[in-house]
Amino acid sequence: SGTTNTVAAYNLTWKSTNFKTILEWEPKPVNQVYTVQISTKSGDWKSKCFYTTDTECDLTDEIVKDVKQTYLARVFSYPAGNVESTGSAGEPLYENSPEFTPYLETNLGQPTIQSFEQVGTKVNVTVEDERTLVRRNNTFLSLRDVFGKDLIYTLYYWKSSSSGKKTAKTNTNEFLIDVDKGENYCFSVQAVIPSRTVNRKSTDSPVECMGQEKGEFRE
């Protein structure tokens, strides 16, 4: 129970892609506002998104401090215009989020094929090393910097004239594949963390085909 007209938040959900992390919840507020707090298991609570009427709060700045920590958030509900009011237990109504460990759970964003280059019967396909909001020494780390060996890419490639797909894998950001001379190929890549139990794969990148701008051909 709590203050009249104030309801506790519910359906607290973490939405996270490449460590960009937003906590969402319900309901849309009617005569109430929310404040969010976030903490690690052993840390102090830090308040964010003070007295907001939004039902989401961007917590990226907090979780990127250490993506291997496990975080817990809670959403406090206050009557609009009277944020000092508390529930019957002497504190505002609040609801806890599920625990969230960014390294284990953040979704892998859709990758992009940066370039491909054909030399004879070989094609070198390069995947863009996407920048994250995780910092080290004042620079933003790429997805590869953060995940290192845990991250691989899968390449799907096929002749433009057929639908039969082949696959290749790399634990760098480059593929070197054999192709038939004189044939045009199309490519799509997917980021994968094989040892994950959830959110193992990204969506496929946009398809890029030979004979388009990104490609380069050399005899």
């Epitope: 291997k68 920590q69 460990t101 845990d150 634990n171 094989p194």
Partner: antibody, heavy 118, light 107 residues
Framework: EVQLVQSGAEVKKPGASVKVSCKAS????????MNWVRQAPGQGLEWMGE????????TYNQKFKARVTMTVDQSTSTVYMELSSLRSEDTAVYYC???????????WGQGTTVTVSS | SIQMTQSPSSLSASVGDRVTITCKAS??????IAWYQQKPGKSPKLLIY???NRYTGVPSRFSGSGYGTDFTFTISSLQPEDIATYYC?????????FGGGTKVEIK
């Protein structure tokens, strides 16, 4: 069920080589790095190196780099660790261990005792 | 390489006691610490990873905490089946290194 089954005990003479196997089952073999850790009698744990079963690429502890070779046979989901130029201080239990996401070793083989004695 | 200093090297406690083991890294390892239990003649078992996360199936009496260079492993209520040697390990920077171990015995 994840299982790592290692080859049996070995007795070797100083200067010889030993090759220990670790057969994996119950999971996607190429999705996890395999590590080798040894433990001398009454002593602690010492990391020797790891291999990527997908590519065969390996990383070794500098201490063993000149003497250790790790290989993989994808067709049988088996990794191998060969240690050459054996000396008495290599007497130990050798474990294979699967590296989990982010680094810890979640599954271990039962261990292979290697005794080096003249 | 990063050195891991574990203490004490051995301890004796009564059933039901709270047991605490510490591990100190020679440089910051962020949350890159795991704790293992090894019973005599058996392979090590992972208990804690990322400094404070319990591994699948590990009882709640086992917990870990810490950040940077100083880490603590706690058994909240010692049980007879907890007799073992416990090791910390840093998985932050290769070569991965282990503490020297703490042998836990029942009084």
């Amino acid at each position: 069920e994840v299982q790592l089954v290692q080859s049996g005990a070995e007795v070797k003479k100083p200067g010889a080589s030993v090759k220990v196997s670790c057969k994996a089952s119950g999971y996607s073999f190429t999705g996890y790095y395999m590590n080798w850790v040894r433990q001398a009698p009454g002593q602690g744990l010492e990391w020797m190196g790891e291999i990527n079963p997908s590519t065969g690429g390996s990383t070794y502890n500098q201490k063993f780099k000149a003497r250790v070779t790790m290989t993989v046979d994808q067709s049988t989901s088996t990794v191998y660790m060969e240690l050459s130029s054996l000396r008495s201080e290599d007497t130990a239990v050798y474990y294979c261990a699967r590296r989990e996401l982010g680094g810890p070793f979640g599954y271990w083989g039962q261990g292979t005792t290697v005794t080096v004695s003249s | 390489s990063i050195q891991m200093t574990q203490s004490p090297s051995s301890l004796s406690a009564s059933v039901g006691d709270r047991v605490t083991i510490t591990c100190k890294a020679s440089q910051s390892v962020s949350t890159g610490i795991a704790w293992y239990q090894q019973k005599p003649g058996k392979s090590p078992k992972l208990l804690i990873y990322f400094a404070s996360n319990r591994y699948t199936g590990v009882p709640s009496r086992f917990s870990g905490s810490g950040y940077g260079t100083d880490f603590t492993f706690t058994i909240s209520s010692l049980q007879p089946e907890d007799i073992a040697t416990y090791y910390c390990q840093q998985d932050y920077s290769s070569p991965w290194t282990f503490g020297g171990g703490t042998k836990v015995e029942i009084k």
